[in-house]
């Protein structure tokens, strides 16, 4: 069986594009060998239409490309301007066509709304590609084919079938003569310049019986689209440059003085420092289109932006481009929020994320910005109950306080949680905010034991020590689970002795679990809040073991009990009762609570974490494991 894999069947309509991904084992040999797309004939052969070595059949001229992604073990064939003639059986493969390293693909193109007939007037955007079609009669099939451009009173030869190319068009023009069945030749001009506009004449033959056709080429400089966005909000530039530049480097630049255009971001890895943490370049499709999202808009972001494609990742003559004029509205509907939130290692952060209050039912998301490649923001949590597995027990997205704000709580912070995080919804895309989480040195304010082992059927008491700075706050214990952090009854045991230089206003608040059952195992949070505004939290993992001796357990800060018969696995998990749970002792030293001056006293931004060794959770919502 061939190791190549792809879609068995692709269905589309006339005029549409398809993007066919073929997968191969990414061995060193496979990554570098020839990739091809061929059409199967009735007699069993397979005629190459396009390959990774640069060959493109005349049938695909100007409308198809093949891009190899060796790091993924994939290559993508894009075919645009589909017609019913494209319906048939194809193969995508590696090496030579006759070998078995291929996959069969059936392409079915049904009748669409109808395509426009070819016209003598070609209106094309700057930097794009034009195909000028030139019909001829049978008697001129073997004769010279040529294209002239009318300069003043005189026609100047641009290209002909004997191999001549006018120097002004070198490297960006070709003449294709269709198969013998079609009495048509085509001239394809890429990377159109403004100077290419004008009257053209194509000709087959040189005598009085020659066939001639006039063409009027209009090259349009894109008018900038006016974009008005709010200060602190978000803008998305959608850039559709056409399939012919699908495998050419893309860029977004901002015009400065004169014709200079400073690169904001490109697919070659360049990113302007001013946009760190607040920009993503998303290849939306393999047809050459992409989008750039910029969040946390600033006054100085206003200006003219161009997106384009060029091999060196910046604006050059002949780059296909789109343009926008961005205006940043300073009378913003988006509330101010800190652009930086600080958290102490081992502690927590509680971040307020703004959203459009008209969209209270929208799904809220929180993601971690990653700068690698072109930037991405993988989701960590959403308001429908999904939490990334590594964050169970330490991450929660709450709809509170509501009315245009939701809260994200992240605890057990480590240095790996430092970075940029985005708050967003599936509604108004303009309401995307960015916050940078910085991890600072210091001691957690809340003090809890590192981890706790409870005994079945007995009573367990878990302490949480609150310093005096939280005297006016509501103190709570809750059990984190897949549906949220359910509030539990707790007891105020009076002043805490865990703090030096702290008066009677410090508090020891205990959680008591009576008649412990298996269901009591899990993560417990203690924390502070003021109304619907959350402050610091601290997390404790409670493991449950069989009864060894009678009595109740009262856990002090000094204790960090491990189940006596546990087996510590290399992966950093431990087995208790044949159930693998993450070992809280792995990060007992890292347990932390964020500095509440940045938290309960008014963090107004989103937060996040990236520790792969810790669990994460969600509050007051449903959660699914995948």
């Amino acid at each position: 069986k061939s190791p190549i894999f792809g879609p068995e069947e692709v269905n589309s309509v006339e005029g549409n594009s398809v993007s066919i991904t073929c997968y191969y084992p990414p061995t060193s040999v496979n990554r570098h060998t020839r990739k091809y797309w061929c059409r199967q004939g009735a007699r069993g052969g397979c005629i190459t239409l396009i390959s990774s070595e640069g060959y493109v059949s005349s049938k695909y001229a100007g409308r198809a490309n093949l891009t190899n992604f060796p790091e993924n073990g994939t290559f993508v064939v894009n075919i645009a301007q589909l017609s019913q003639d494209d319906s048939g059986r194809y193969k995508c493969g590696l090496g030579i066509n006759s070998r078995g390293l291929s996959f069969d693909v059936s392409l079915e193109v049904s009748q669409g709304p109808g395509l426009l007939n070819d016209t003598k007037v070609y209106t094309v955007d700057l930097g794009r590609t034009v195909t000028i079609n030139c019909p001829f009669k049978t008697e001129n099939a073997q004769k010279r084919k040529s294209l002239y451009k009318q300069i003043g009173l005189y026609p100047v030869l641009v290209i002909d079938s004997s191999g001549y190319v006018n120097p002004n068009y070198t490297g960006r023009i070709r003449l294709d003569i269709q198969g013998t069945g079609q009495l048509l030749f085509s001239v394809v001009i890429n990377q159109l310049r403004l100077s290419d506009a004008g009257q053209y004449l194509c000709q087959a033959g040189d005598d009085s019986n020659s066939n001639k056709k006039n063409a009027d080429l209009q090259v349009l400089k894109p008018e900038p689209e006016l974009v008005y966005e709010d200060l602190r909000g978000s803008v998305t530039f959608h850039c559709a440059l056409g399939p012919e530049v699908a495998n050419v480097a893309k860029f977004l630049c901002r015009q400065s003085s004169g014709e200079n255009c400073d690169v904001v971001v490109n697919t070659l890895g360049k990113r302007a420092p001013a946009f760190e943490g607040r920009i993503l370049l998303n290849p939306q499709d393999k047809d050459g289109s992409f989008s750039v999202v910029i969040t946390g808009l600033r006054k100085e972001d206003a200006g003219r932006y161009l997106c384009g494609a060029h091999s060196d990742g910046q604006l050059q003559e002949g780059s296909p481009i789109q343009a926008w004029q961005l205006f940043v509205n300073e009378e913003s509907t988006i509330p101010r929020s800190p652009t930086v939130v600080k958290g102490v290692a081992g502690s927590s952060v509680a971040v307020l994320c703004p959203y459009n209050r008209k969209e209270s039912k929208s799904i809220k998301y929180w993601c971690l910005w990653e700068g690698a490649q072109n930037g991405r923001c993988p989701l960590l949590v959403d308001s429908e109950g999904w939490v990334k597995a590594q964050y169970e027990g330490r991450l929660s997205l709450l709809e509170e306080p509501g009315n245009g704000t939701f809260t994200v709580i992240l605890n057990q912070l480590t240095s790996r949680d430092a970075g940029f995080y985005w708050c967003l919804t599936n509604g108004d895309t303009l309401w995307r905010t960015t916050v940078e989480i910085k991890i600072i040195e210091g001691e957690p304010n809340l003090k809890v034991p590192g981890n706790v082992t409870a005994v079945l059927g007995e009573t367990l008491k878990v302490p949480c020590h609150f310093p005096c700075k939280f005297s006016s706050y509501e103190k709570y214990w809750c059990k984190w689970n897949n549906t949220g952090c359910q509030a539990l009854p707790s007891q105020d045991e009076g002043p805490s002795k865990a703090f030096v230089n702290c008066d009677e206003n410090s508090r020891l608040v205990s959680l008591t679990l009576n008649l412990v059952t298996r269901a009591d195992e899990g993560w417990y949070w203690c924390g502070v809040k003021q109304g619907h505004f959350y402050g610091e939290t601290a997390a404790v993992y409670v493991a449950v073991e069989e009864r060894k001796a009678a009595g109740s357990r009262d856990v002090s800060l000094a204790k960090a009990d491990a189940a006596p018969d546990e087996k510590v696995l290399d992966s950093g998990f431990r087995e208790i009762e044949n159930k693998a749970i993450q070992d809280p002792r792995l990060f007992a030293e890292e347990k932390a609570v964020a500095d509440t001056r940045d938290q309960a006293d008014g963090s107004r931004a989103s937060v996040d974490s990236g520790s792969s060794e810790e669990q994460g959770g969600s509050s007051r919502h449903h959660h699914h494991h995948h």
Partner: nanobody, 130 residues
Amino acid sequence: EVQLVESGGGLVQTGGSLRLSCAASGRTFSPYAMGWFRQAPGKEREFVAAIRWSGATTYKYVGDSVQGRFTISRDAAGNTVYLQMNSVKPEDTAVYYCAADRVPKDISIDPRNPKDWDYWGKGTLVTVSS
């Protein structure tokens, strides 16, 4: 809350046919790809078939072991996917799981990889008797 509910499983004789359905529901949930995996006792989860759509274009993928026998399709709304199982064999006995992807990925994912799917159903048992 997003839910994928499989139905149509049951007992079928070798050489027979069965049609599985998977309905996706949930507030504002609109998948862009749905697929089927199966898991026989003691074996890894195996890719069966998937369907992905973009505008008027549909891409169908089928696993090696079921090629030519199983076909995948979807309803016009795109929230229900079907697996038509023909010429079934005893080795097709397994729990069949429906999978769905909520958002298009920035880079093309391999539909055969269970890790690349966001949502899963609880599964429906298909038993092929000889």
